[in-house]
């Protein structure tokens, strides 16, 4: 039945980029400017998306495909097909419902999006703080306090990184 119907329906022959024009005896007419049809057999063309304001054009609309938008600098995409633009914050900040806020003491964010995360607690791994944390950077953990006993060099390189769950040899 599906095959029969397609044989009888002249619109099924209209390719992408055209529409089946009922006003012109179901002739396949090209999509008007600023519209598209991405599949064959369509009776109307869809209006092209316009990337305005904070949205900028990533891909121009063609007769067979819609325009694609992304966000201008200072914003990043959210939602399917970049339906929304959310503002970036500076490093050392997080985006809240009321805008960008500085990271609280003891937390950091090294990116322009996302939330502030707590500094690493070096003592949990038996290490000491080598470099203090900031709003933009995590602390750097150094050797354990025992390794820094009098007479020991304070510039010894930290032990090689080991996988979690593995004990030192």
């Amino acid at each position: 039945f599906e095959r029969t119907r397609s044989l009888q329906d002249p619109c099924s022959n209209c390719p992408a980029g055209t529409f089946c024009d009922n006003n012109r005896n179901q002739i396949c007419s090209p999509c008007p400017p600023n519209s598209f049809s991405s599949a064959g057999g369509q009776r109307t063309c869809d209006i092209c998306r316009q990337c305005k304001g904070v949205f900028r054009t990533r891909k121009e609309c063609s007769s067979t495909s819609n325009a694609e938008c992304d966000c201008t600098p200072g914003f990043h995409c959210l939602g399917a097909g970049c339906s929304m633009c959310e503002q970036d914050c500076k490093q050392g900040q997080e985006l809240t419902k009321k805008g960008c806020k500085d990271c609280c003491f003891g937390t950091f964010n090294d990116q322009k999006r996302g939330i502030c995360r707590p500094w690493t607690n070096c003592s949990l791994d038996g290490k000491s703080v080598l470099v203090n944390g900031t709003k933009e950077r995590d602390v750097v953990c150094g050797p354990s306090p025992a390794d820094l006993s009098p007479g020991a060099s304070s510039v010894t390189p930290p032990a090689p990184a080991r996988e979690p769950g593995h004990s030192p040899q």
């Epitope: 985006l95 809240t96 419902k97 009321k98 939330i115």
Partner: nanobody, 124 residues
Framework: EVQLLESGGGLVQPGGSLRLSCAAS????????MTWVRQPPGKGLEWVSS????????YYADSVKGRFTISRDNSKNTLYLQMNSLRAEDTAVYYC?????????????????WGQGTTVTVSS
């Protein structure tokens, strides 16, 4: 599949009112806080209001406080935004969003699902 479908947008004169609705499906609605955000033309997202899963706690952006009211009907799986005394600066696409937990605040977004949006135009 989790879905949020907004409705109720349109053209309204300054000083007028509109009521937006958001029909939710695909999850236990009463277990999650919900949020309205908006995107004015040419600008970024702006948080409008949030409500806890039970409806007992509500939060508003300063720009809409006293004019907008968020509410929910958990028996109908629907979120509402009553907008009164509308101003030209309220013109935007309004999005309904599901938060990741039942509680909410005026701080973190914590949004994991967005609707498609409904357009509100305030103009004389």
């Amino acid at each position: 599949e989790v879905q949020l479908l907004e409705s109720g947008g349109g053209l309204v004169q300054p000083g007028g009112s509109l009521r937006l609705s958001c029909a939710a499906s695909g999850f236990t609605f009463s277990n999650y806080a919900m949020t309205w955000v908006r995107q004015p033309p040419g600008k970024g997202l702006e948080w409008v209001s949030s409500i806890s899963g039970s409806g007992g706690s509500t939060y508003y952006a300063d720009s809409v406080k006293g004019r907008f009211t968020i509410s929910r009907d958990n028996s109908k799986n629907t979120l509402y935004l009553q907008m009164n005394s509308l101003r030209a600066e309220d013109t935007a696409v309004y999005y309904c969003a599901k938060e990741g937990t039942g509680t909410t605040s005026d701080y973190y977004y914590n949004v994991d699902v967005w609707g498609q949006g409904t357009t509100v135009t305030v103009s004389s």
